[in-house]
């Protein structure tokens, strides 16, 4: 037999206090997959984090981060705080990058210069906390 | 027990307004989130508004957007809905509602009272 519950559309849940039919889910809430008997509760988009997109009857509600701050995790699940370039973050806040090593974006962490030797070749143009070296013949 | 019992339902021309009410008992509405739905005529249930207990945000249907407000009265344990500027379409019976929330993290809702019935003809 067939599960009546499987007729029920996204945006909807199978209510079994009213004989199976689909009802709509409340506000604030939504279902994405057709069948559900229960609809999920809307992610919220508070303090550091803003709405980028607001939540249907069928899809959640997706989250990015205020000015200065970025998105970290699966799904924006966390927000981190910008830095300079030539900067990286650490627990005392961020932080010029050592000699030797750059960073040339407002996330993630300081990264050594390219050795050009390596390669057998030469620095053409010297890094900085912002940028790499630039290798040469 | 919990209960909810709506009222002033009616019929009213084009243009008019009503107050529903919902006397809820068995629950402190100041607690929970609620609202209301209705259904009109041979369709399904739709939601028109509601109000979350968290901070109070109010929730509306794009078609009740400007013309319905939903409000409590944590005193009386009654919900309301000012309906003005009705139109054809309003016609329905109109349930009060309440958020069921499940274990597994899930919501629902449940309509306990008989609704009110509200048609809109000239």
């Known amino acids: 037999l067939q599960d009546p519950c499987s007729n029920c559309p996204a945006g909807t849940f199978c209510d079994n206090n009213r004989n199976q039919i689909c009802s709509p889910c409340p506000p604030n809430s939504f279902s994405s997959a057709g069948g559900q008997r229960t609809c999920d509760i809307c992610r919220q988009c508070k303090g550091v984090f803003r709405t980028r997109k607001e939540c249907s009857s069928t899809s959640n509600a997706e989250c990015d981060c205020t000015p200065g701050f970025h998105c970290l995790g699966a799904g924006c699940s966390m927000c981190e705080q910008d830095c300079k370039q030539g900067q990286e973050l650490t627990k005392k806040g961020c932080k010029d990058c050592c000699f030797g090593t750059f960073n040339d974006q407002k996330r993630g962490i300081c990264r050594p210069w390219t050795n050009c030797s390596l390669d057998g070749k030469s620095v053409l143009v010297n890094g900085t906390k912002e940028r790499d070296v630039v290798c040469g013949p | 027990e919990v209960q909810l019992l709506e009222s002033g339902g009616g019929l009213v021309q084009p243009g008019g307004s009503l107050r529903l009410s919902c006397a809820a008992s068995?629950?402190?509405?100041?607690?929970?989130?609620v609202g209301w739905v209705r259904q009109a005529p041979g369709k399904g249930l739709e939601w028109v508004s509601a109000?979350?207990?968290?901070?109070?945000?109010?929730y509306y249907a794009e078609s009740v957007k400007g013309r319905f407000t939903i409000s409590r009265d944590n005193a009386k344990n009654t919900l309301y809905l000012q309906m003005s500027s009705l139109r054809a379409e309003d016609t329905a019976v109109y349930y009060c509602?309440?958020?069921?929330?499940?274990?597994?993290?899930?919501?629902?809702?449940?309509?306990r009272g008989q609704g009110t019935q509200v048609t809109v003809s000239s």
């Open positions: 509602a309440r958020y069921v929330y499940h274990a597994g993290g899930g919501v629902t809702f449940d309509t």
């Open positions: 068995g629950f402190t509405l100041s607690h929970e989130d």
């Open positions: 109000i979350l207990d968290s901070g109070g945000s109010t």
